[in-house]
């Protein structure tokens, strides 16, 4: 920052609430799409340009005027892998977090015209090109269809689809949200011969029902009904199939070959949790028991003579956890070598740190190729010579991210490709590799302004800067911006990291109000090196509030000892650690311990509420947005991963003593703002309704706000502005700020 250390002499404006809500200062991205091993697409002034990665020269791939006469607002586009067609998406209608329906048209890039025959139907739920060529698979009305050519009729693959009952090629609510993080449940083989798909059956899954009020003119509210398995309830069942798309014909029904779950899964409830093609005729499936501490990977080969898929028991790989659950959120995906006979996978090592292990398909044991008291975040690319991964090893900072490569012929030869590129500005990287990993884009997201650069894998040479946010940097020179502190405290001989957004001209001899911004869910991380312009930026810059976050027990990327500490005990250590963090912050000398607040959303709303209901005396006030209040109200896959089942034989006792409602009496000691969207499909309004009822029943005065027809994100433009304005008023009143 330019100016002086003296706040009174600094005439620059602060970052205001309006700046946040109106997005006055915009971070520039550089979103590219690789189309080959040396070319990528980039949208500039609505023209789609194709860039040569090596030389940086570009040409117009598609002019912005091409679709002037189209008559629809194009939401997204997707180019076929062979570059012959472009799929245009319009009439986008959001469903849940990832799911939506849309209309699609296909433009022939050679003929320079829209294909008007055999069009994809409106309200299509998912569409995807094959990995090579230009086949299309799509899901409409819960059934799967394939187009061999864009202008040819679709071949119907399934006939069983039924709304809210049978889902072919798409996920139901819980699989979308908690397992695949996607609407799609379709997986093309690498050359597009086979299409694998999952089928979910929600026949017995109970429905969540809530009112949707819609337009003022609607006399009777609509009732939304969603199959949603709450903890302990009946779950969806899953089947898995593969169809050979070369066999499809209009005059005979497609033959889908089922691959059944391993016997060790079929003994009880289970999930399909990963699908990865290893080769053209080899597929790996990972299955997970409902009690999520045991998973099995099956490796299945196509038998050409029978047209069936065979999964040899000798090739099964079991992954289990004795201290918690498998994977960070689910078992990690395998990265197969070219021949499909071996793969690399992130698993927990004996010390409980997640590292890369090398598996051969016919051998049970694997060889760890990385080790240390840090974790591998993700495998990003695999070539014949190197494996590229992101980890938080550098400088022992769990909240950092850097790109590494490891030589496959000698695992001791590890190079950090990003660590020293710009060490002050850039400590948190993600990466996007070209098709065969010849080039890569590094995306640095902090602690300085985001920086996008292009590199060659041949010599790891930086080729060029794609976006450096210099225009934003110039603008922010004229703003009194907060600073960010990332550090750790030691509790019980363990490092726990925190971050603080500190007001401009921070003076450690002064006393500041502090807002604890909490999430604290399993495998979460709130203390990191990412640059953000958010509500906290406003609170620190304009209101001189310190906004802190703390990663206590249960948080991720620091080993299972920390992460699995809350296994079967949600609402305990992660809650206590937020309170302890606030106490520690109070002792640092610059915090006004009479003005400490806490806020969080979703799991953070639960922790906020549990903290405020703890009777600790540390917090004056807090805000819970869309909180969980009782784990039996939340979905089965997420909840049971950490809590087991709400049965007397399993963990019912802790389900019952980890509710917000049981702490109602203690809310008399704090100021509480409770907020929820009425159309929250994820954390149901029911959860806040029950908090409210419990507080009313014991005579607690509290503030509340509902957002009509808003879901878990409360993200519509008006609601977003309203909620942050409302919360700002609440915090300012709590802290006695003008």
């Amino acid at each position: 920052n330019k100016g002086t250390d003296d706040a009174t002499a600094d005439s620059r404006k602060t970052y205001t609430l309006t700046d946040y809500l109106k997005n006055t200062y915009r971070l520039k991205l550089y979103s590219l799409r690789w189309i080959s091993d040396h070319e990528y697409l980039y949208k500039q002034e609505n023209n789609i340009l194709v860039f040569n990665a090596e030389y940086g020269n570009s040409s117009v791939f598609l002019e912005n005027s091409t679709f002037d006469e189209f008559g629809h607002s194009i939401n997204d586009y997707s180019i076929s892998p062979d570059g012959q067609f472009i799929l245009l998406e319009y009439n986008y209608v959001k469903q849940w977090r990832h799911s939506y329906t849309a209309s699609y048209d296909i433009y022939d890039l050679n003929k320079r015209q829209l294909i008007t025959e055999e069009r994809i139907p409106n309200n299509t739920q998912w569409v995807t090109w094959s990995p090579v060529g230009h086949k299309l698979a799509y899901v409409w009305n819960n059934d799967i269809y394939v187009k061999i050519e864009p202008n040819l009729p679709s071949y119907r693959i399934t006939w069983t689809g039924k709304e809210d009952i049978i889902y072919n090629g798409i996920t139901d609510w819980v699989y979308e949200e908690e397992v695949f993080s996607a609407y799609s449940a379709l997986w093309w083989s690498p050359n597009g011969t086979f299409l694998a798909y999952a089928q979910f059956n929600d026949t017995e899954v109970p429905l969540i029902e809530y009112s949707f009020y819609s337009d003022e003119s609607l006399q009777y509210p609509k009732t939304v009904r969603v199959p949603y398995p709450k903890a302990g309830a009946v779950n969806p069942t899953v089947k898995f199939f593969v169809v050979n798309t070369d066999s499809l014909s209009s005059v005979t029904n497609a033959t889908s070959i089922q691959i059944t779950a391993p016997a060790s899964m079929l003994i009880g409830d289970h999930y399909l949790c990963d699908v990865t093609w290893a080769t053209q005729e080899r597929i790996s499936l990972q299955w997970l028991r409902r009690i999520q501490n045991y998973s099995v990977m099956d490796i299945c080969d196509y038998d050409e003579s029978s047209g069936r898929w065979n999964c040899l028991v000798a090739r099964q790989h079991i992954e289990m956890s004795t201290t918690g659950w498998v994977g960070r959120f689910r078992p990690s995906e395998p990265h197969f070598t070219l021949d499909g006979n071996s793969f690399y996978k992130i698993i927990s090592n004996e010390e409980g740190y997640r590292h890369i292990c090398y598996f051969q398909i016919d051998k049970k044991d694997c060889t760890f190729i990385t080790k240390g008291t840090w974790e591998v975040i993700g495998i990003e690319a695999l070539t014949s010579d190197y494996l590229y991964y992101i980890s938080n090893e550098y400088k022992g900072m769990p909240g950092g991210r850097n790109l590494y490569k490891i030589q496959l012929s000698d695992y001791t030869k590890v190079t950090c490709l990003s660590c020293e590129l710009n060490p002050e500005r850039c400590q948190y990287y993600s990466v996007s590799f070209s098709k065969e990993a010849k080039y890569y884009q590094l995306r640095c997201s902090g602690p300085g302004l985001p920086l996008y650069t292009l590199h060659s894998s041949v010599n790891d040479k930086g080729l060029r800067v794609l976006e450096d946010n210099s225009a934003l940097d110039k603008m922010l020179q004229n703003v009194q911006m907060p600073s960010k502190k990332l550090d750790f405290i030691i509790l019980n001989e363990t490092k726990f990291w925190y971050q603080m957004i500190l007001p401009p001209h921070f003076d450690k001899s002064k006393k500041y109000p502090l807002l604890l911004d909490v999430y604290a869910g399993p495998c979460s991380q709130k203390a990191d090196t990412v640059f953000r312009l958010n509500w906290a930026t406003y609170l620190a810059s304009t209101e001189n509030i310190i906004v802190a976050s703390f990663d206590g027990r249960g948080s991720g990327y620091q080993g299972d000892k920390i992460m699995h500490a809350i296994n079967r005990r949600l609402g305990t250590f992660e809650v206590e650690d937020q309170i302890e963090a606030a106490r520690q912050f109070s002792k640092m000398g610059f915090v006004d311990n009479k003005r400490i607040a806490i806020w969080g959303w979703s799991y953070g709303g639960y922790v906020t509420s549990m903290v405020l209901g703890s009777g600790s005396g540390v917090f004056k006030c807090g805000i819970a947005v869309a909180p969980v209040s009782r784990w039996e109200y939340y979905d089965s896959v997420y909840t049971e991963r950490y809590m087991g089942l709400p049965t007397p034989e399993d963990n019912l006792d802790h389900y019952r003593n980890s509710t917000v409602m049981s702490r109602a009496e203690n809310f008399k000691q704090v100021e509480y703002l409770l907020i929820h969207g009425t159309a929250d499909d994820n954390v149901h309004f029911q959860q806040s309704a029950q908090i409210s009822k419990a507080l009313v029943d014991v005579g607690v005065d509290f503030q509340a706000m509902w957002y009509t027809d808003e879901d878990h994100g409360i993200a519509s433009s008006t609601a977003h502005q309203h909620i942050y304005t409302h919360m700002s008023h609440f915090i300012k009143q709590c802290f006695s700020l003008p």
Epitope: E149, L152, P153, N244, D246, S247, S249, S250, V251, G307
Partner: antibody, heavy 116, light 107 residues
């Protein structure tokens, strides 16, 4: 390279049973259907039936009672059996590969003459 | 069954000519129509699938069009190797049926 090589045929007596073979190479019979089409002397092409990749069969109703199409995937061979031969079954018989909704590769054809 | 009617049954044209063969279906078959070429030695080849799509390896002088009930095959620049009999075939419904053929000769 995809190829269909036909064998069998020749001179048959009325009432006899015809069994023709069609050996495929370059692809699997579990993936693509094999159709049988015949052509009587001086006439056009006539579809007889199909065995699909999964082994299901469909026949033209005019041959339904007399025809059987089968395959041995281990030998990559499809078969046409036509019972109770009569003079009007004299024709060139073709096997052809089903790709989606068209016949993309054809056998060379085999001549069958039914005569006493 | 769907009847396929092809015309003419035979035609004579000169090298370099543009030749059109038509085919009509007894009921609507959308675009589910294929064209085949049978050489004098009996060898059969796919030319066009789904009304207008050229099979790989087929010269671009061949083109197909039409939908519903009326279809045509056009050879834009007749060459000597095009001497053959041409058949249309519907593939929308079993049993598959062929046209009666058009024999093309060189004048």
């Amino acid at each position: 390279e995809v190829q269909l090589v036909q064998s069998g045929g020749g001179l048959k007596q009325p009432g006899e049973t015809l069994r023709l073979s069609c050996t495929a190479s370059g692809y699997s019979l579990t993936t693509y259907g094999v159709h049988w089409v015949r052509q009587a002397p001086g006439k056009g092409l006539e579809w007889m039936g199909v065995i699909w990749g999964d082994g299901r069969t469909d026949y033209d109703s005019s041959f339904m009672s007399r025809v059987t199409i089968s395959k041995d995937t281990s030998k990559s061979t499809a078969y046409l059996q036509l019972n109770s031969l009569r003079a009007e079954d004299t024709a060139v018989y073709y096997c052809t590969r089903n790709r989606h909704d068209w016949f993309d590769y054809w056998g060379q054809g085999t001549t069958v003459t039914v005569s006493s | 069954d769907i009847q396929m009617t092809q015309s003419p049954s035979s035609l004579s044209a000169s090298l370099g000519d543009r030749v059109t063969i038509t085919c009509s279906a007894s009921q609507g078959i959308r675009n589910s129509l294929n064209w085949y070429q049978q050489k004098p030695d009996g060898a059969v080849k796919l030319l066009i699938y789904y009304s207008s799509n050229l099979h790989s390896g087929v010269p671009s002088r061949f083109s197909g069009s039409g939908s519903g009930t009326d279809f045509s095959l056009t050879i834009s620049n007749l060459e000597p190797e095009d001497i053959a009999t041409y058949y249309c075939q519907q593939s929308i419904k079993l049993p598959f049926t062929f046209g009666s053929g058009t024999k093309l000769e060189i004048k």
